[in-house]
């Protein structure tokens, strides 16, 4: 169908509430163009009727709410006047909130879920909510370990938690909770935090972190289009480059005539005593000469590589 | 360091209660849930039930609802475990053992309990 | 529940050689809720591997593990005195929790 296909990271989300995630890739949604979502390869699109559980809304795909069975790789079209683009977003669905029970719940920590608070400072927590404009939330509540916070360290401004003179104590799990409003419905959303107190300036001290990757192997067709974003937790007062590089050569000098791989513009999240900073690598199209290089992100002395594999031949299909 | 210390070795007569207990340190007691697991002279391991000392919310195996009553103290990061109405069929070696958030396994065990019953 | 039967329930092997024991269970398990234990005589089980394949802090790496659905592995590529003893596999995938029957690794 002449779309070049682009894959995203994957999402762990809570069952029995709402979940949107917006269809933006920067290099092409900026222009006109059209996005149509679809789950699983269907050739038939999501719904775009607003009292459909899961539907479109404008670039947004909007769960309302989400349940186990969504779980499944999502793919948004992106079509513009001479380009076509296939975003595939792989959702993961958890059943059980933690102040339920343990089992069957969050099953691994990413960094989302974790934040830090100063010991002995003035500090804050956020509670992370991106839902398209449709959707209107009320005033956030907040928990640690499953009960409601209350006392007179803490205030609540707008998406924050703010949390004076922190203490050892103020470590555990948070939650923040919010009701969502959406055609006249309601609906709870919930999210989970793990808090960790510490009383350094710094993060980790001044080795940078590669999240991601992790020194691995991605399968991935010939010819297609791959995105791999490179992501980085470094102090904020930090001088250290980040990039990606192939045989020892920075991508943008190594592939200077076709610029077939490219390195993306880095752009960075600010936390209280740290920067999650991405910087991708994309293939505008995997060539056989791609499978078993390794790319490399380096930050300062830290580096981590990605090796492209062929995946292996399914012989089912014969 | 995390750690789960379990109270000492039990003799009871059966139709007897014991109570065993659990006193972690090293992490934040009420941000997790304890799980307490069984094992027979011999045979695998049963689990019993957990208990969030966060909210106090207890989550049974259906086998041992009737069996086992875990509860808390939160003042001294302790979790207890009361077994009634003991047969000589609940001789077992019991466990305690945490889990947190994001972590859906046990990655800390106490040391074990023995309890006895015998006439 | 989710019944998990592990095989064999005994494996006779000298130091050196290669283990190769299975789970199955009786409905599909994520592999994020998927684990395995290891327990000596007298002492507590130990976290030897969590999420299918990741070992866990201090576990030297001749153990490893694979598998998805129903079907999970344990593999340990050469067997050294210190890992004779019994395995467990574990699922936390739905209540109540259920752990197979065990593989007891003797010598041979």
């Known amino acids: 169908d002449g779309c070049k296909d682009i894959f995203m990271k994957n999402e762990i989300l809570s069952a029995s509430q709402p979940f949107a995630f917006n269809c933006t890739f920067p290099p092409i949604t900026s222009g006109e163009v059209s996005v149509t979502w679809y789950k699983n390869s269907s050739k038939i699109p999501v719904s775009k009727i607003i009292q459909s559980r899961i539907h479109q809304d404008e670039t947004w795909i909007l769960f309302l709410p989400m349940e186990w069975g969504d779980s499944g790789v999502y793919q948004c079209v992106i079509k513009g006047r001479d380009s076509c683009h296939r975003i595939h977003v792989n959702l993961t669905v958890f059943e059980k909130h933690w102040c339920d029970t343990s089992i069957g719940g969050l099953p691994n920590l990413s960094d989302e879920y974790k934040q830090i608070l100063h010991l002995g400072k003035d500090d804050s927590l956020t509670c992370h909510l991106h839902f398209p404009k449709s959707c209107v939330l009320g005033p956030i509540k907040w928990y640690k370990d499953c009960n409601e916070i209350k006392g007179e360290r803490f205030t609540v401004l707008e998406t924050r938690l703010l949390v004076s003179n922190v203490s050892a104590e103020d470590r555990g799990n948070y939650a923040c909770q919010a009701i969502l409003t959406h055609s006249g419905k309601q609906y709870e959303v919930l999210n989970g935090i793990t808090v960790s107190i510490t009383e350094r300036a710094g993060y980790g001290g001044s080795v940078p972190k590669i999240i991601y990757p992790k020194n691995h192997s991605i399968e991935v067709q010939l010819g297609t289009t791959l995105i791999v974003d490179c992501n980085v937790t470094d102090t904020k007062d930090n001088t250290n480059l980040r990039c990606w590089r192939v045989n020892n050569t920075l991508v943008d000098d190594y592939y200077d005539e076709s610029k077939r791989i490219r390195e993306g513009v880095e752009t960075h999240v600010s936390f209280r005593e740290h920067n999650l900073y991405t910087v991708n690598i994309t293939f505008l199209e995997v060539k056989m000469e791609d499978y078993g290089l390794p790319f490399m992100c380096h930050a300062g002395v830290s580096t981590a590589y990605i090796i492209l594999q062929l995946p292996a031949p399914d012989f089912r299909a014969y | 360091q995390v750690q789960l210390v379990q109270s000492g070795a039990e003799v009871k007569k059966p139709g007897a209660s014991v109570k065993v207990s659990c006193k972690a340190s090293?992490?934040?007691?009420?941000?997790?849930?304890i799980h307490w697991v069984r094992q027979a002279p011999g045979q695998g391991l049963e689990w019993i039930g957990e208990i969030n000392p966060g909210n106090v919310r207890t989550n049974y195996n259906e086998n041992f609802r009737n069996k086992a009553t875990m509860t808390v103290d939160t003042s001294i990061s302790t979790a207890y475990m009361e077994l009634s109405r003991l047969r000589s069929d609940d001789t077992a070696v019991y466990y305690c053992a945490v889990v947190f958030y994001g972590e859906p396994y046990f990655p800390y065990w106490g040391q074990g309990t023995l309890v006895t019953v015998s006439s | 529940e989710i019944v998990l039967t592990q095989s064999p329930g005994t494996l006779s092997l000298s130091p050196g050689e290669r283990a190769t024991m299975s789970c199955t269970a009786s409905s599909s398990v994520s592999s994020s809720y998927f684990h395995w234990y290891q327990q000596k005589p007298g002492q507590a089980p130990r976290l030897l591997i969590y999420r299918t394949s990741i070992l866990a802090s201090g576990v030297p790496d001749r153990f490893s593990g694979s598998g998805s659905g129903t079907d999970f592995t344990l593999t340990i590529s050469r067997l050294e005195p210190e890992d004779f003893a019994t395995y467990y596999c574990h699922q936390f995938h739905r209540s109540p929790l259920t752990f197979g029957q065990g593989t007891k690794l003797e010598i041979k």
């Open positions: 090293g992490y934040s007691f009420t941000s997790s849930w």
